[in-house]
Interface confidence: medium
């Protein structure tokens, strides 16, 4: 028997520095977790102790903090090189700055293979990108070889900016021939490493003949066997075992997100490359693990330029941006409108002639808007200003919901109106009218939404049985502020870009902004 240790990360999302327990900015260092300096300490410990070790990443290193805003992916290549990753799969967020923003800082600079079997380049891009990412890679490990095949969510064109010269094929259809090719090369130990979410990971384990292990990402799935060490609730045991269609037991793993855990899976293979046993658990990278001093010094050095960025002007406002709780928790506020407009603008994807865009709606809890911005400071807006408005380090995500769920969400928005509570929704692409004289749960008297399948966008009544795409904060997607119905009833959830980054990009693009209160939210006569 031959034993392999797989160390894995996924959805790190620019958390190069240690973070608080909830993966936001580290405040009390003695309680902080993760970060590449701490990860390196643990990886080196394991490399010294065990003979056959692979360090793999399942995508979405890009996007999530000011590190990515400033360094644009160069930080990913640099620190992944420093940690000596063995392979990475492309995630959807790796395309956030377009194909060029992937090629130059990451694909050309990475000293490890970057993989995806279901992304096919065409046109002029084909020759430009040739060899910079691969469908698979055969890695020597000790005296053996291990094949790694990559895959990426086929939803990427809706979630990011890959352009028109990359085709995202069905994962299973694309993976099978590459695995077959590995088999003909006498590679009998094959890991599928990819970024399509836990449900697809399990399908790959079930359907793709010859895959021995699946290491996934995208859904931020936390798996654990035994008592979990932190706040995350396991979605299943680690590894999650799937019985394949040809009767094999295939371990599937994922390691939550944000570099908080290092996935640790030990696999035992027989001489024919069959998995005999698999066991392990994610390792919580808490403060009991010291940060490696050389990587930490490198992080400190890179930090110098970040601090200065946060005070630079992104653009100007010529109006007061009312982010006060007195406004945003009671009525339409222009800060809410600005943020929602930025959220929609960030998700413009012209992928189909029938649709002007794939999504037109935004909802945003008023309680998530934490500060106004005064235009009398020469109109200047900085990252620092925006960090006061959106201090929680969240993301603006894409969900699919039925109209009936949206209706419940808007009822929840005003179910206890008047108490300055955070659930009052700010909107974009939605016209809502409330009648507060009616009883809670029956206060939404009009709910019109902007069409997407139209050449001239207009507002139509919400249909209860129709499925709609909506952009919203991850906080709401996870049921925050009492929006349990969103969490329970959502049909799809894809994590998006860092909230501040979305708004800062929009302001930089617009240069001068002047959001108004324009009748998105109304109260019917006599009730307000």
């Amino acid at each position: 028997a031959w034993e392999l240790t797989i160390l894995h990360t996924n959805d790190v999302h620019s958390r190069l520095e240690q973070t608080s327990e909830d993966s936001s900015k580290c405040v009390n260092a003695s309680r902080c977790m993760g970060g590449v300096a701490r990860l390196f300490t643990k990886v080196q410990q394991i490399r010294r102790a065990e003979p056959n070790v692979l360090l793999l990443d399942a995508g979405d290193q890009y996007q999530g903090t000011i590190w990515f805003t400033v360094y644009k992916g160069a930080e990913v290549a640099h620190f992944m090189n420093a940690l000596r990753y063995d392979a990475m799969a492309l995630g959807n967020h790796e395309f956030d700055n377009g194909v060029e923003g992937l090629i130059e800082p990451l694909l050309k600079e990475a000293k490890f293979p970057i993989l995806s079997a279901n992304i096919k380049a065409k046109g002029p891009l084909a020759s430009q990108i040739s060899g910079l990412y691969l469908p698979y890679k055969v890695l020597p490990v000790g005296d053996e070889v291990v094949g790694i095949v990559g895959y990426t969510s086929k939803e990427t064109p809706f979630l990011s900016n890959p352009g028109t010269n990359l085709v995202f094929e069905d994962e299973i259809t694309a993976l099978q021939p590459e695995v077959d090719k590995l088999k003909t090369l006498n590679v009998n130990k094959i890991i599928a490493l990819g970024h399509s979410g836990f449900e697809m990971d399990k399908l790959i384990a079930q359907k793709v003949r010859g895959v021995d292990v699946v290491v996934g990402g995208h859904s931020n799935t936390f798996l654990y066997t035994g008592n979990p060490p932190s706040k995350e609730v396991p979605a299943g045991k680690y590894p999650f075992i799937v019985t394949s269609d040809d009767g094999r037991k295939v371990p599937v793993v994922q390691a939550y997100a944000f570099g908080k855990y290092l996935g640790y899976l030990k696999i035992e293979f027989d001489e024919r490359g069959n998995v005999i046993s698999s066991h392990g658990n994610p390792i919580l990278l808490n403060s009991s693990i010291p940060e490696d001093p050389s990587i930490k010094a490198d992080i400190n050095k890179w930090r110098i330029k970040l601090d200065n960025y946060s005070t630079q002007e992104l653009g100007k406002t010529i109006v007061y941006l009312d982010g006060s709780s007195q406004s945003c928790r009671f009525r339409e506020c222009n800060m809410g409108n600005l943020i929602c407009d930025a959220m929609i603008n960030n998700n413009l994807r012209h992928t189909d002639e029938m649709f002007w865009n794939h999504v037109s709606m935004c909802i945003l809890n008023g309680g998530g808007i934490r500060s106004p911005i005064d235009e009398r400071n020469n109109g200047t807006i900085t990252w620092e200003n925006l960090a006061a408005v959106l201090p929680f380090g969240g993301t603006f995500d894409l969900v699919q919901l039925k109209g009936s769920t949206l209706k419940k969400a808007f009822e929840h928005s005003v179910h206890r109106y008047g108490q300055s509570t955070g659930e009052f929704l700010q909107v974009g692409g939605i016209h809502v009218v409330y009648d507060l004289s009616r009883k809670p749960g029956d206060r939404v008297v009009k709910l019109d939404v902007l069409c997407t399948k139209c050449r001239v966008p207009s507002y139509d009544p919400l249909k209860m049985d129709e499925v709609y795409k909506v952009i919203l904060p991850n906080f709401l997607a996870n049921g925050g502020d009492g929006f349990q119905m969103i969490k329970d009833e959502l049909l799809r959830h894809d994590s998006g870009d860092q909230d501040i980054n979305v708004v800062s990009t929009y302001i930089s693009k617009m240069k001068v902004i002047y959001p108004a209160v324009e009748g998105r939210i109304k109260f019917s006569t006599g009730s307000h």
Epitope: K72, K301, I304, N308
Partner: antibody
């Protein structure tokens, strides 16, 4: 081989604007900061500011901020320094330099251009 | 901003002598065991050239007679067995915070 090649000498009148260029080759232009430094005749070195070509982010010395614009064109791997409202005291040799901040030099300036002499005189 | 003060301003030495140039920072430029101080050599009509980075690391291609030391606010550039080709200006520079600044320079003359 890493090279930074600057544009030629300039003679300008007070109040005018000058734009000098720095074309780089031999490394990934978008992944390293480019710094601009000036040296008046017979004097020391002054840090003007820098740019990260990958994102266009810039930092400026407060002393010069109102008159200086640093930019970069990724497509031709070239950084620019534009200086407006020139005064006689701006007469100096202007250098571009590559910061080694993504390796081990920690923002030390590991490669320099040959310099561009800007003379401001009426 | 951090002010760097070099001493001496001028030094005249004979070949094979040892030269020591100091650079004092108005504020600590070291952290996490690293010192963000660098040394450059500039010959007349030429661009400066990096000699030492991070206080004590010799840039590749620089002869080993050049060395650097220091931590916190006080740093030293030493040239052992100085040669005639070492006649030049020498500058220190910090990169601890923005703006980065340079010392005023030390002129080394070989008799």
């Amino acid at each position: 081989e890493v090279q930074l090649v600057q544009s030629g000498a300039e003679v300008k009148k007070p109040g005018a604007t000058v734009k000098i260029s720095c074309k780089v080759s031999g490394y990934t232009f978008t992944s390293y900061w480019i710094t601009w430094i000036r040296q008046p005749p017979g004097k020391g070195l002054e840090w003007i500011g820098d740019i990260y070509p990958g994102s266009g982010n810039t930092n400026y010395n407060e002393k010069f901020k109102t008159r200086v614009t640093i930019s970069a064109d990724k497509s031709i791997s070239t950084a620019y320094l534009q200086w407006s409202s020139l005064k006689a005291s701006d007469t100096a040799m202007y250098y571009c330099a590559k910061e080694g901040g993504l390796t081990t030099e920690d923002y030390a300036l590991d490669y320099w251009g040959q310099g561009t002499l800007v003379t401001v005189s009426s | 901003e951090i002010v760097l003060t070099q001493s001496p301003d001028f030094q005249s030495v004979t070949p094979k002598e040892k030269v020591t140039i100091t650079c004092r920072a108005s504020k600590n430029v070291s952290t996490s065991g690293y010192s963000y101080m660098h040394w450059y050599q500039q010959k007349p009509g030429k661009a400066p050239k990096l000699l030492i980075y991070l206080a004590s690391n010799l840039e590749s291609g620089i002869p080993p007679r050049f060395s650097g030391s220091g931590y916190g606010t006080d740093f030293t550039l030493t040239i052992n067995n100085i040669e005639s080709e070492d006649a030049a200006y020498y500058f220190c520079q910090h990169s601890r915070e923005l703006p980065f600044t340079f010392g005023q320079g030390t002129k080394v003359e070989i008799k």
